[in-house]
Structure formats: structure tokens, C-alpha cells
Amino acid sequence: QGGTRSPRCDCAGDFHKKIGLFCCRGCPAGHYLKAPCTEPCGNSTCLVCPQDTFLAWENHHNSECARCQACDEQASQVALENCSAVADTRCGCKPGWFVECQVSQCVSSSPFYCQPCLDCGALHRHTRLLCSRRDTDCGTCLPGFYEHGDGCVSCPTSTLGSCPERCAAVCGWRQMF
């Protein structure tokens, strides 16, 4: 009954891979490999990932689960989805905050911190693009306000107020009284 190495696993069903002497069935997501199978085409001994650890994919080789990430409170991150045996914690920003990447080439795994979204209303501006993946994009001044420097200034309520050219263009109707 000598064994010979076979370059591929001739086992019924999918997901068998050579682990040492034998072709073994791997472990499902959320489980780690405690011990490989002990016979051809056998089941490996797989155990559920302990609390606060996970494995997202079926695997033949992971003898321990990955530790769940902790969201960085100092970066104002919050857990959008808690860690499970099959998925890592999904960290993000709470409503009214947006993700500011800490590296120039930003990908999903890049480090980030959360910034409060601009409140266009408080700046007396129209909201052109709501804040989610990036900061709020504010538009032109709300009615009754005109552009002055970097901000929006309230139209004068009486003719006594000085009204520069841009003010007159927006608030001109007020000057007639």
C-alpha cells in the first residue's frame, strides 16, 4: 500500500489540495486548520475562529485566524460593521463626517481619519454635493447673501449699509427702498 505523489488531487468534489502526504479538503471560511487530513481525500480538522478573529476565505493552510482590526478612535473612526468569524470589522466615519486618506494613492485598506463635513448652511451656501466619500461641496451663496472674499455676507437690510458692486448685483432690489 505504498503512496505516490500525485500532482493534482483525484478526489470527488472541489476544494481538495495536497497538504503533506495527502490531498485534503480545506476549511470553510470562518474556520482555521487544526490538523490536516490523515488519509487520502479526507477532511482536515477545522475549528471555528475564536472571538475577535476571522478568516474570510476557504483555506487549506491557515493554522490561525486573523485578528479583527480595531477602529482607530483617535482618528474618529467608528465600526460600520462588527467583526464576524468570516469578515473583518468595517471601519468608517459616522454620519456628518468623511474619510480623509492618509496616503496619496488611496485604496480601501489605506489608513484614514475622519473629518467633520462642512455645513454649507452654516456658511450660507447651497449644498452642491452631499458629504460621504469626500467633503461636502458647497455652491453659491443662499438667497439674501452675496459673495464677499471667501464667504457669504448677508444683504444689507437698509439703504444705510454700504453695498459694493457684487452686493448690488445680488441685493440691488433692496436698494430701491
Epitope: 503512496g3 505516490t4 503533506g20 502526504l21 487544526k34 490538523a35 490536516p36 487530513c37 490523515t38 488519509e39
Partner: antibody, heavy 116, light 107 residues
Framework: EVQLVESGGGSVQPGGSLRLSCAAS????????MSWIRQAPGKGLEWISY????????YYADSVKGRFTISRDNAKNSLYLQMNSLRAEDTAVYYC?????????WGQGTLVTVSS | DIVMTQSPSSLSASVGDRVTITCQAS??????LSWYQQKPGKAPKLLIS???NLETGIPSRFSGSGSGTDFTFTISSLQPEDIATYYC?????????FGQGTRLEIK
Amino acid sequence: EVQLVESGGGSVQPGGSLRLSCAASGFTFSSYGMSWIRQAPGKGLEWISYISSSGGHTYYADSVKGRFTISRDNAKNSLYLQMNSLRAEDTAVYYCARGSGSFDYWGQGTLVTVSS
Amino acid sequence: DIVMTQSPSSLSASVGDRVTITCQASQDITNYLSWYQQKPGKAPKLLISDASNLETGIPSRFSGSGSGTDFTFTISSLQPEDIATYYCQQYDTLPITFGQGTRLEIK
């Protein structure tokens, strides 16, 4: 603590028989493949037999095939090696070891001497 | 059968030396290779599995590398308690086979 304790060794004449036992404790015996490995005096290690966790698959080195039989009793946490038609060249310390390839735990060994 | 050729068969080194043992397989064994330490009158002890995976509780001065047919075992700084015989072993294919051993002694 994982422990493997061999017994049953001794002196026997050529052509004789011996049955070695290996008592396992400290782990789930029924989940592991087990092997017998021997070492002749002053020589290297030689794997001689393997049995799967269920006992359904057994393998032997050519040097012992047809003469030795490996078996196990998972209810008793025990591994066995029945050795028949013993020869002088079977003289060695016999170790039982846990694993399906890489042997992470070994017993202390039992000496088998085949001599007339 | 896969033949495992270990070299050297014996070596003498001083405490603190870097010691290297090589093991060559007669055919590709991927990374299915273990290293064992055996002291006189004792059972072998598993040090490294899967060519480079240091077993729990084994000091970090021991390391292994290689894949395919050529493998290396290294002790980065030899200690007096490392005096022993070291064996490589393949578990890619039955029958499982061992190298002939390397006897390590202190100068």
C-alpha cells in the same frame, strides 16, 4: 500535556513475534494519524508504518511490509505494532509518533532486540 | 523512494558560531520538510516543519529555509545545549524518509 508511552519491547529470537503498544494521552487521539519509526543502534531514523486517524488507511515501508501490522484502538487511546517473522536487522529502538508527516510528539521509545 | 542527503555528516563548532546544515532531496518535495534534534538516549524533537515554520517553544536561533530539492537548517549562535544529532525528513511522498543525520559537537 501530550504523552506517548511505548511498551512491549524485549528480546526475541529470529522468526519470533512481538506486539508493541503506545498509550496516548493529553490530546484527542482519534483526530491524529500515527506512525512507528525505528532507530537501529548507532544508526539514523527509519519510518516504518503509518495509520490514519480512523484506522482505515495503513502504509508500510518495504522493509517491513507483509511482516508488521499497524493498528489502533481509539476507544483505548492506543496504537499497536504487531511484528512477526522478526529478523536481526529489526533490532532497534521503536518510537511511536504523532502526525501525518511532520511528527510533533514522540514517545521515549522501546528497545527490540532480535538475536539467537 | 525519495532519498534525503544531508551534509555534513558531522561538524565541530564553537559556542557563538553560526552553524549551517544542508539537506538535498532526490526529487521535488515542495516545502514538505522537517528538521529534528536528537540528543543521546532521547527521542527526536521537532524543531521546524514546512521547511521554515519554527515550532512553538523552539528558540529563535534555529531557522530553516528552502523549497523544491534544496534546504538549509541554521543555528545563528551555537549554544552548549545544541550539541545533538540533527535530521531532515521529507513528508511529500510515502514512504517518509529521513536524512542520515548530522552530528554536531563543540570545539
